[in-house]
C-alpha cells in the first residue's frame, strides 16, 4: 500500500507480487518524484483501493496501456 | 497452465486443529491469490478467505475470523489453510482455488481435501 | 456483504428442455466505468470441485458448450442451458466478484426427468 510521507508526497516502498486483472483497476498515477525511493505506479482499483506495483513489469505496463485506451474519448 | 494439488484426507476430534496444503504447480505461488473455500456435505460453497492483493494481506470471512490461518511458504510454492476449534459442523471439502489474474472469482481449483470431525 | 440468491433451488427438465437459473445480488454489481458486471457461474458434479461455466455475467469459459448462455446486469442475472443434456446433470452457483468478501447462491440442482 502507498505510504504519505510528508504529505503531498505519496510513496512506495514495497510493490505487489500478486498479478492483477485489468478488470479490477480503475485508474493510476505514476510516482516519479525525487523524494521516493523509488518509481512506481499506484493503481487505484473499482472498490478504490490502492495497490503499489512495479513500473518495470509487463502486466503493470499492460494495465496501463488498457486503462490509458480505455480513458480515451472516442473520435466521433 | 496452472496446477493446485492439496493434501489427503483427515479425521479429526473436536476441538483439535488440521491444517491443509495445495501446491502450486505451473506457477509461481507469489504471483498467485490463493483462496480457499470450503462445502460441507449437501451443502453449498462457502469462501473461508485468501490473499487478497487489493488489501495487500490475507483476508478472513467473518465467521472464521480468529479460527483460521492462511499462509504461504514459497520456497516449496505450497499454500496452507488451518482452522482450530474444531467442531462436527466444521466436517467438509476444502478448496484451494486461485486464477492467474486477480479478479475475484476461481478458474483453478485444487481436487479437494475431505475432513471430517467426529468423536 | 452481497447476498446472492438463486432460484429455483434444484429443477427437473426432459432431456433437450429448456433450463433458466436464476441469480439475484443484494446490490449491483455493475462497474459502470466498464460497464461489467462482476460475476460467475459455476458447474459441480459429484465428486468434483466447481468448473467455471461464464465470467462477466455473460462470457462462456473456453471450451463450454455453446447450449450455456447467461445473461443480466446489476442485480438480477439468469444462466440458461438451451437444450439440456445428461452430462449437464450438475448444481450450478453464481458468485459475485464485486467486492470482498466472494459470495456464492446457495445453488440449482438440475436433474432429468
Known amino acids: 500500500q502507498p505510504d504519505a510521507i510528508n504529505a503531498p508526497v505519496t510513496c512506495c516502498y514495497n510493490f505487489t507480487n500478486r498479478k492483477i486483472s485489468v478488470q479490477r483497476l480503475a485508474s493510476y498515477r505514476r510516482i516519479t518524484s525525487s523524494k521516493c525511493p523509488k518509481e512506481a505506479v499506484i493503481f487505484k482499483t473499482i472498490v478504490a483501493k490502492e495497490i503499489c506495483a512495479d513500473p518495470k513489469q509487463k502486466w503493470v505496463q499492460d494495465s496501463m496501456d488498457h486503462l490509458d485506451k480505455q480513458t480515451q474519448t472516442p473520435k466521433t | 497452465q496452472v496446477q493446485l494439488v492439496q493434501s489427503g484426507a483427515e479425521v479429526k476430534k473436536p476441538g483439535a486443529s488440521v491444517k491443509v496444503s495445495c501446491k502450486v504447480s505451473?506457477?509461481?505461488?507469489?504471483?498467485?491469490?490463493m483462496h480457499w473455500v470450503r462445502q460441507a456435505p449437501g451443502n453449498g460453497l462457502e469462501w473461508m478467505g485468501g490473499?487478497?492483493?487489493?488489501?495487500?494481506?490475507?483476508i478472513y470471512a467473518q465467521r472464521f475470523q480468529g479460527r483460521v490461518v492462511m499462509t504461504e511458504d514459497p520456497s516449496t510454492d505450497t499454500a496452507y489453510m488451518e482452522l482450530s476449534s474444531l467442531r462436527s459442523e466444521d466436517t467438509a471439502v476444502y478448496y484451494c482455488?486461485?486464477?492467474?489474474?486477480?479478479?475475484?472469482?476461481?478458474?483453478?481449483w485444487g481436487q479437494g481435501t475431505l475432513v471430517t470431525v467426529s468423536s | 456483504d452481497i447476498v446472492m440468491t438463486q432460484s429455483p433451488d434444484s429443477l427437473a427438465m426432459s432431456l433437450g428442455e429448456r433450463a433458466t437459473i436464476n441469480c439475484k445480488s443484494s446490490?449491483?454489481?455493475?462497474?459502470?466505468?466498464?460497464?461489467?458486471?462482476?460475476l460467475v457461474w459455476y458447474q459441480q458434479k459429484p465428486g468434483q470441485p466447481p468448473k467455471l461455466l461464464i465470467y462477466?455475467?455473460?462470457i462462456r469459459e473456453s471450451g463450454v458448450p455453446d447450449r450455456f448462455s447467461s445473461s443480466g446486469s446489476e442485480t438480477d442475472f439468469t444462466l440458461t442451458i438451451s437444450s439440456l443434456q445428461a452430462e449437464d446433470v450438475a448444481v450450478y452457483y453464481c458468485?459475485?466478484?464485486?467486492?470482498?468478501?466472494?459470495?456464492f447462491g446457495q445453488g440449482t440442482k438440475v436433474e432429468i426427468k
Open positions: 482455488a486461485t486464477n492467474e489474474f486477480w479478479s475475484g472469482y476461481f478458474d483453478y
Open positions: 505451473g506457477y509461481t505461488l507469489t504471483e498467485l491469490s
Open positions: 490473499f487478497d492483493p487489493e488489501d495487500g494481506e490475507t
Open positions: 446490490q449491483s454489481v455493475l462497474y459502470s466505468s466498464n460497464n461489467k458486471n462482476y
Open positions: 462477466w455475467a455473460s
Open positions: 458468485q459475485q466478484y464485486f467486492s470482498s468478501p466472494w459470495t
